[in-house]
Every structure is written in structure tokens, then in C-alpha cells.
């Protein structure tokens, strides 16, 4: 049951369900927008973002964007609605509990992005090939 004062005052678009009909609750994500980063040539990195924020909408997931150009490396951490593109890319891995970086084609820079749907999951960003979800056995591990 939904608590009565939530039931009467929460607009219906707050009651969001996933594909299995389970109710989705507002998520906690690291949310530092764009910060300079020292994360480079590592299998995984911590975001070093000290801000954990509650996402505005229950459907929003955590996102991390890692960018490297000739001058610097940045890491962006935000909440975002997976129905909407981010940096012109679809969040195809939004249901993953882990933030597994995938490279995207962007001219003039190296660009990786990941999204995930467990609390603060964009605090630990994973570049390692061993998490590549094209391996069906790993899908079982990641989504358990």
C-alpha cells in the first residue's frame, strides 16, 4: 500500500513502473555535473564526487560521462531520464545496476558514457573489458 498522504498528494506521474510492473522509486545518484578528473588508463575509477542527490523523477537513472581531449580529462555525473538522449546518445544500458562505460564516437575527443539504475551506481565507473555485456554469462552476473 502507498502511504495515504503520498497517495492523495503525489501526482500520478510520480508512480512509475518498470517493464515488469514494479514501482520505481526516486534514485540517489552522484551529481557533480562536469569536474576535472585524474581517471585515465584504469579498469575502473571512483567519481570523487561528494554530492549524492535525489533524482527529480522516479524514471531517472544515474549517468557518468568520461571525456578526454588534448588538454584535459573530465567526468560528468548526473541524473537523467533514459527516454531522452543525453549528449545525443540513447542510454541503452539504463537498467544495469553497474555503470559500465561504452565508447561513443565524438570528433576531437575520446568519449565514454554509462548509465545505471541502482543508488549511487555512477560513483564507480567501469571501463574493464571483462564487464562487456555482449557475453551472455556476464549478463547473468550483472543483473542478479
Amino acid at each position: 500500500t502507498i502511504p495515504p498522504h503520498v497517495q492523495k498528494s503525489v501526482n500520478n506521474d510520480m508512480i512509475v513502473t518498470d517493464n515488469n510492473g514494479a514501482v520505481k522509486f526516486p534514485q540517489l545518484c552522484k551529481f557533480c555535473d562536469v569536474r576535472f578528473s585524474t581517471c585515465d588508463n584504469q579498469k575502473s575509477c571512483m567519481s570523487n564526487c561528494s554530492i549524492t542527490s535525489i533524482c527529480e523523477k522516479p524514471q531517472e537513472v544515474c549517468v557518468a560521462v568520461w571525456r578526454k581531449n588534448d588538454e584535459n580529462i573530465t567526468l560528468e555525473t548526473v541524473c537523467h531520464d533514459p527516454k531522452l538522449p543525453y549528449h545525443d546518445f540513447i542510454l541503452e544500458d539504463a537498467a544495469s545496476p553497474k555503470c559500465i562505460m561504452k565508447e561513443k564516437k565524438k570528433p576531437g575527443e575520446t568519449f565514454f558514457m554509462c548509465s545505471c539504475s541502482s543508488d549511487e551506481c555512477n560513483d564507480n565507473i567501469i571501463f574493464s573489458e571483462e564487464y562487456n555485456t555482449s557475453n551472455p554469462d556476464l549478463l547473468l552476473v550483472i543483473f542478479q
Epitope: T1, I2, H5, I15, F25, P26, F31, S53, E56
Partner: antibody
């Protein structure tokens, strides 16, 4: 009517571990619509969030407690508990267990009556 | 973490008067601010959540307003049972944090 009630020792020695239990009645702790947590209030002072969780979700702790806090759940007894290690006199407080709607995470709509824990040798 | 500053620390008023309590956040908390009432020896009680929504069973004389960094709790006409300490709390950034409280006392 869903209610929460704290229980545990009122006196703990410095450097030891404080252990409290919260019993939930009138509803199931496994109902993910509700979040559960602990808040404390030192005598004559304000309120401090210790940590919270909802069933199936991650437990969130206040970083100020530097990993000393552990919240665990026992669905068979409809209880959750708090352990706070390496306590000092600064941990003397009234400890409240609490419930809130997960749809508005962080809001507390039901509190236990509170239990005073004194840290002293 | 976000710091909430409540003012005044103490408010001395008579029954029937209007009480205006302020809560200021060190950075934006959007509309994610709640107000609680605490009487001596009791646990806090939720009054208002998300800046302006009254919790179940809370009388209409309690109202909340504000967004971003500045919030107000108004008690339109004080009843004898309203004399207590009032805390604001944000849930925008975690951990949730509380203000230091405003005591509303009988003048």
C-alpha cells in the same frame, strides 16, 4: 496502524559497539513503498540522520559516521537493527527508528518514541 | 553536506498570533524541504513535506512555502498545543540534514 519501536541497552561503554533493534508492527518491513532508518538526537541538541534503506534497495549511511554504522534487516522478525562501533561520549543521544514513504525518500512520517543511549564507563 | 539555518532561534508569541519561521539552505534544495514539530520528551512529528504539502492529519493553520534556498513555515493562529520546537529538513542532497531548530514559546 503501522508503528515502529526501538529496544536495546541504555548504557554502552566507550570503544564498544552500540546495538539497537527496531520492531515494526502493523505492516511489513518488506513493503518497498516504505523506507526505514535511524536518526539520533544528542541531549538538548538537533537531529542527525544515521542511515536508511528500503527493501530491495541499497542502504545509505551518513558519511560523517565514517563507516561505524551498520543497518541490517530481519524480515522473519519484521525488525531492523543498528550497530554503531567504537562509540565515544559524543554518541550519547536519543536514538529514533523511523519510517517514511519511499516515493518521497528522506521524509519521515512515523517515528519511534526514542531510546536514550548513554556512552559512559 | 547542506547546512540549514533556522531563524529566529526563539520566537515568543501569544496564542492566536501568527508565527513565521524561516529556514535558509547553504545551497539550493529545490523544493525538497520538510518541517517537523517536536514537543519535550516526544519524537518529532511531520508537518509539511516538499515545501508546501501538509502531511496527513495536520491542521490547515500550518502552511509552508519557498523553494531553492529560502523557506517559510507559517502558523496562521497559534493554538496552545503549537508551542514547541520546529525543525526544517532537506532531502535534496544526501545525507538529509536538519536545521538547528526554532523554539516557539509562550510570551
Amino acid at each position: 496502524q503501522l508503528q515502529v519501536q526501538e529496544s536495546g541497552p541504555g548504557l554502552v561503554k566507550p570503544s564498544e559497539t552500540l546495538s539497537l533493534t527496531c520492531t515494526v508492527s502493523g505492516g511489513s518491513i518488506s513493503n518497498a513503498y516504505f523506507s526505514w532508518g535511524w536518526i539520533r538526537q544528542p541531549p538538548g541538541k538537533g537531529l542527525e540522520w544515521i542511515g536508511s534503506f528500503y527493501y530491495g534497495g541499497k542502504t545509505y549511511y551518513n558519511p560523517s559516521l565514517k563507516s561505524r554504522a551498520t543497518i541490517s534487516i530481519d524480515t522473519s522478525k519484521n525488525q531492523f537493527s543498528l550497530k554503531l562501533s567504537s562509540v565515544t561520549a559524543a554518541d550519547t543521544a536519543v536514538y529514533y527508528c523511523a519510517r517514511g514513504p519511499t516515493l518521497i525518500r528522506g521524509v519521515i512520517d512515523s517515528w519511534g518514541q526514542g531510546t536514550l543511549v548513554t556512552v559512559s564507563s | 553536506e547542506i547546512v540549514l539555518t533556522q531563524s529566529p532561534a526563539t520566537l515568543s508569541l501569544s496564542p492566536g498570533e501568527r508565527a513565521t519561521l524561516s529556514c535558509r539552505a547553504s545551497q539550493s534544495v529545490r523544493s525538497y524541504l520538510a518541517w517537523y514539530q517536536q514537543k519535550p520528551g516526544q519524537a518529532p512529528r511531520l508537518l509539511i513535506y516538499d515545501a508546501s504539502n501538509r502531511a496527513t492529519g495536520i491542521p490547515a493553520r500550518f502552511s509552508g512555502s519557498g523553494s531553492g534556498t529560502d523557506f517559510t513555515l507559517t502558523i496562521s493562529s497559534l493554538e496552545p498545543e503549537d508551542f514547541a520546537v520546529y525543525y526544517c529538513q532537506q532531502r535534496s542532497n544526501w545525507p538529509p540534514t536538519f536545521g538547528q531548530g526554532t523554539k516557539v514559546e509562550i510570551k
